[in-house]
């Protein structure tokens, strides 16, 4: 038997993926464990094998279909179980009634690109990936810019309280290298959280014209 504190957390990406992390103090690394998904109103079940990500935590993705297919709705409830092999039997280690649209975490924004860059400003655009059409425009974004000599954690957060897939960064220093990241969150869902940060986009402001006041 496995003793200790257990935590089982899952998020729905709003389309066809439920990502789960199970942590259990004192669990055995070489035990085979599965996450089992049992929807209340669908004809499919889905499993994924939990793989170790640290000493006491495991993760897997329940892939419900093609990436952009809408596999669950706001009324669905999915019973999620962690089952681990004990000899020839399988023991339920954790269970939750999962409401997908109350536990959202979207994919990181993609396709970041510089639309226009000047000496002091830069216009950047991006796209959201695998986001449900149910949200319509009910999304918000956070962005941050990495300046020379600073860390991402020190970068101030810029909040876009609407579905706006671009930003104009102002008051930048001429001829300077920057990096930019953005993340997205639906407004819906009691336990909804921010997406991962996008891959950073590197850009450089244009140098100031010679003889001009900067």
């Amino acid at each position: 038997a496995v003793n200790g504190t257990s935590q089982f957390t899952c998020f729905y990406n709003s389309r066809a993926n439920i990502s789960c992390v199970w942590s259990q103090d004192g669990a055995l690394q070489d035990t085979s464990c599965q996450v089992h998904a049992w929807p209340d109103r669908r004809r499919w079940n889905q499993t994924c094998e939990l793989l170790p990500v640290s000493q006491a935590s495991w993760a897997c993705n329940l892939i419900l279909g093609a990436p952009d297919s809408q596999k669950l709705t706001t009324v669905d409830i999915v019973t999620l179980r962690v089952l681990c092999r004990e000899g020839v039997r399988w023991r339920v280690m954790a269970i939750q009634d999962f409401k997908p649209f109350e536990n959202l975490r979207l994919m990181a924004p993609i396709s970041l690109q510089v639309v226009h860059v000047e000496t002091h400003r830069c216009n950047i655009s991006w796209e959201i990936s695998q986001a449900s059409h149910y949200f319509e425009r009910h999304l918000e974004f956070e962005a941050r810019t990495l300046s020379p000599g600073h860390t991402w954690e020190e970068a101030p957060l810029l909040t876009l309280k609407q579905k706006q897939e671009w930003i104009c960064l102002e008051t930048l220093t001429p001829d300077t290298q920057y990096e930019f990241q953005v993340r997205v969150k639906p407004l819906q869902g009691e336990f909804t959280t921010w997406s991962p940060w996008s891959q950073p986009l590197a850009f450089r402001t244009k140098p100031a014209a010679l003889g001009k006041d900067t």
Partner: nanobody, 123 residues
Framework: QVQLVESGGGLVQAGGSLRLSCVVS????????MAWFRQAPGKEREFVAV????????EYVDSVKGRFTVSRDNAKNTVYLQMNNLKPEDTAVYYC????????????????WGQGTQVTVSS
């Protein structure tokens, strides 16, 4: 709908080897737990081996343990059954099976199936 196509069967002498392949199309391959079954003439279809979605865990029927190895290549949408030290009693049609539910795949009812490939082991 998911489609499965097996290949690699044939006639082999006892003690020989064969490698079966099963290519999956029509859906996201990594959704599926994959298994091999076999059916000898006049007998029921029996479970041979299973491999989880990640490929990390495999299981076998006792009669093939140590001789057969199941594996998968998620980049190629393919599952394999490497069969060594074949015996005449391994003669059967070998079927590839797919199920999104690991816990259902051994019961044949809800699986997706290939058309099968004949393996004949002569003594």
């Amino acid at each position: 709908q998911v489609q499965l196509v097996e290949s690699g069967g044939g006639l082999v002498q006892a003690g020989g080897s064969l490698r079966l392949s099963c290519v999956v199309s029509g859906d996201v391959f990594v959704r599926y737990t994959m298994a091999w079954f076999r059916q000898a003439p006049g007998k029921e279809r029996e479970f041979v081996a299973v491999v989880t979605d990640s490929g990390r865990t495999t299981e076998y029927v006792d009669s093939v343990k140590g001789r057969f190895t199941v594996s998968r290549d998620n980049a190629k949408n393919t599952v394999y059954l490497q069969m060594n030290n074949l015996k005449p009693e391994d003669t059967a049609v070998y079927y590839c099976a797919a199920n999104t539910d690991y816990f259902q795949i051994r019961s044949v009812d809800n699986n997706a199936w290939g058309q099968g490939t004949q393996v004949t082991v002569s003594s």
